[in-house]
């Protein structure tokens, strides 16, 4: 099946201090390689989460990525702050015979808009 990375929401709004889910699904797990979440693009992009076992404070996977044939690579960001605002991309990499892995597909991005916490 042809690989497609889908981020269904163009944007989500979340109040500061709350948590939000950023959805990402794949149509295929092939080719073999990791899925990573970034905020921003190009040189200034920031790694937010990687489905490779590292620990990322405040960011967790929504479903069990270790389950066989799991296609859901959504993440939850907890205790959102204004600094979390930006566009988040779910990116699929192909594992190379040697590093680094090659980016092969990305979701269209989800803009996170952080609202002031209601007083």
């Amino acid at each position: 099946k042809e690989l497609k990375v889908t981020q269904p929401e163009k944007s989500v709004s979340v109040a500061a201090g709350d948590s939000t889910v950023l959805n990402c699904t794949l149509t295929s797990l092939l080719p073999v390689g990791p899925i990573k979440w970034y905020r921003g693009v190009g040189q200034s992009r920031l790694l937010i989460y990687s489905f490779t076992g590292e620990h990322f404070p405040r960011v967790t996977n929504v479903s069990d990525a270790t389950k066989r044939n799991n296609m859901d690579f959504s993440i939850r960001i907890s205790n959102v702050t204004p600094e979390d605002a930006g566009t988040y991309y779910c990116v699929k990499f192909q594992k190379g015979p040697s590093e680094p892995d090659t980016e092969i597909q990305s979701g269209g991005g989800t803009e996170v808009y952080v609202l002031a916490k209601p007083s």
Partner: antibody
Framework: DVQLVESGGGVVRPGESLRLSCAAS????????MNWVRQAPGEGLEWVSL????????YYADSVKGRFTISRDNSKNTLYLQMNSLRAEDTAVYYC????????????WGLGTLVTVSS | ETVLTQSPGTLTLSPGERATLSCRAS??????LAWYQEKPGQAPRLLIY???SRATGVPDRFSGSGSGTEFTLTISSLQSEDFAVYYC??????????FGGGTKVEIK
Amino acid sequence: DVQLVESGGGVVRPGESLRLSCAASGFTFSSYDMNWVRQAPGEGLEWVSLISGSGEIIYYADSVKGRFTISRDNSKNTLYLQMNSLRAEDTAVYYCAKENNRYRFFDYWGLGTLVTVSS
Amino acid sequence: ETVLTQSPGTLTLSPGERATLSCRASQSVYTYLAWYQEKPGQAPRLLIYGASSRATGVPDRFSGSGSGTEFTLTISSLQSEDFAVYYCQQYYDRPPLTFGGGTKVEIK
């Protein structure tokens, strides 16, 4: 049928203000993000501003930030662009454009309204 | 921001000929690219989105291809109504949404 009709263009002096309107019909206006795109005489298309369906997410091009204000009235199916401190370089045809529901490309455009800033 | 460069600036062809328009991105936009047609006095019209998907009602002589940083719009056999200005637009890196400078297809 989707229809977008811009109005409010005209000739103004530098430093003056103008308010553009875009009347929308043929779709559920409040469900779609809307944009203003402009085209200076003999030039290409330039994105100006974006507002989400609910009105809570707003972005501007750097060239108009602090001078232009985008807004919408979902009860009237109308998009607005308040343009203050106008400059000669703001002279352009201003188009109202409806975004696709999933991605930030424009599936429908209006015919545009001409704004001329001249002393 | 992602800069889009279109070439050539002007393409002079005869009806029935094949037109090939190029759009190059300064960084990868994957397949998040659209093409529009603009004619004087008319609203711009969406032709292609997702780099290769034709919008509703667009004739099949229009086709898009490419991914990453290199994209092409092809008009297989030019009709009189196809002489216009064509713009590419990326919607991967946003905002700002950016357009190419346009390619004018004119009659020889």
